[in-house]
């Protein structure tokens, strides 16, 4: 029985050239998190594996940084980074939980950064 829920930063915006933290948090379950995938619809950005550590996809190595926690930091943002991002939590014994974040990268300096939180 999967009882957990994923909380995310939801819809967030950031300035072109800036950085943003993508953050998900799994709650309401005692399941053990064994791996977290960070993805776009057809691209793997990074994986954090409990045994193997972090893996950043080579095409994102220059502007993706692991953390904080199980989150992901995107740097040197471009307008092309606008879109959906997914955190995929692999857990034992529950299975897989998924959260979605929509990022809008704005040209102007009035971009409002969405609420952020750290994984305890």
């Amino acid at each position: 029985m999967m009882t957990g829920t994923i909380e995310t930063t939801g819809n967030i915006s950031a300035e072109k050239g800036g950085s943003i933290i993508l953050q998900c948090h799994l709650s309401s379950t005692t399941a053990q998190v064994t791996q977290v995938n960070w993805e776009q619809q057809d691209q793997l950005l990074a994986i954090c594996n409990a045994d193997l550590g972090w893996h950043i996809s080579p095409s994102f190595k220059d502007r993706v940084a692991p953390g904080p926690g199980l989150g992901l930091t995107l740097q040197s943002l471009t307008v092309n980074d606008t879109g959906e991002y997914f955190c995929i939590y692999h857990t034992y014994p529950d299975g897989t939980y998924t959260g979605r974040i929509f990022l809008e990268v704005l040209e102007s300096s009035v971009a409002e950064h969405g609420a952020r939180f750290q994984i305890p």
């Epitope: 993805e39 994986i47 193997l52 995929i88």
Partner: antibody
């Protein structure tokens, strides 16, 4: 429980366009996920052809160049495959499949055999 | 494109045997590999994702391991219904690609 069902002509002439439809029941294709076409020539392995996402974004296998088009009819909860300029090498079982975010395929249709022959 | 090379291409075994199939990726895919079972005239069935995770309902005799470029799929004790063709697939980047398959036959 989501179910996928392929339909379309079982025989297509060389140089013509192959057209298939996948009807999805038990889940709206506009709610989530990416909806894919995967084919398997007789006695051979699997080839991913492309997808249309719940938002309408498409992605294709470059090996099929510009021959493939995937579209959808949200009113019928269907998505479709068109493959142009077919040859005998396009003879295959064509599957529609729902992709999970991680790039794997937990749900498939039963497949439909399309033969390209004159 | 990332090539996935499976071995062996065919394998004969008996009920109760432990069977191992390997898959080698042409580049580092970390843990982004899935395994499928396909029976004649049927669609593939997902058995393993992310190298080692079993979807709900898949028997525990099926397991996967590996990371980087080398991956292993194991059936700990073959059952009569396990005789089929098995495919690996990389889920690291598009175009998603499959191995050529391993046909598991009754000895």
């Amino acid at each position: 429980q989501v179910q996928l069902q392929e339909s379309g002509p079982g025989l297509v002439k060389p140089s013509q366009t192959l057209s298939l439809t996948c009807t999805v029941s038990g889940y709206s294709i506009t709610d989530d996920y990416a909806w894919n076409w995967i084919r398997q020539p007789p006695g051979k392995g699997l080839e991913w052809m492309g997808y249309i996402s719940y938002s309408g974004h498409t992605k294709y296998n470059p090996s099929l160049k510009s021959r493939v088009t995937i579209s959808r009819d949200t009113s019928k909860n269907q998505f479709s495959l068109k493959l142009s300029s077919v040859t005998a090498a396009d003879t295959a079982v064509y599957y529609c499949a729902r992709k999970y975010y991680g790039g794997w395929f937990p749900r498939w249709g039963q497949g439909t055999l399309v033969t390209v022959s004159s | 494109d990332i090539q996935m090379t499976q071995s062996p291409s065919s394998l004969s075994a008996s009920v109760g045997d432990r069977v191992t199939i390997t898959c080698k990726a042409s580049q580092d895919v970390f843990t982004a590999v899935a395994w499928y079972q396909q029976k004649p005239g049927k669609a593939p069935k997902l058995l393993i994702y992310s190298a080692s995770y079993r979807p709900t309902g898949v028997p525990s005799r099926f397991s996967g391991s590996g990371s980087g470029t080398d991956f292993t799929f194991t059936i700990s004790s073959l059952q009569p219904e396990d005789f089929a063709t098995y495919y690996c697939q990389q889920s690291y980047s598009t175009p998603w690609t499959f191995g050529q398959g391993t046909r598991l036959e009754i000895k």
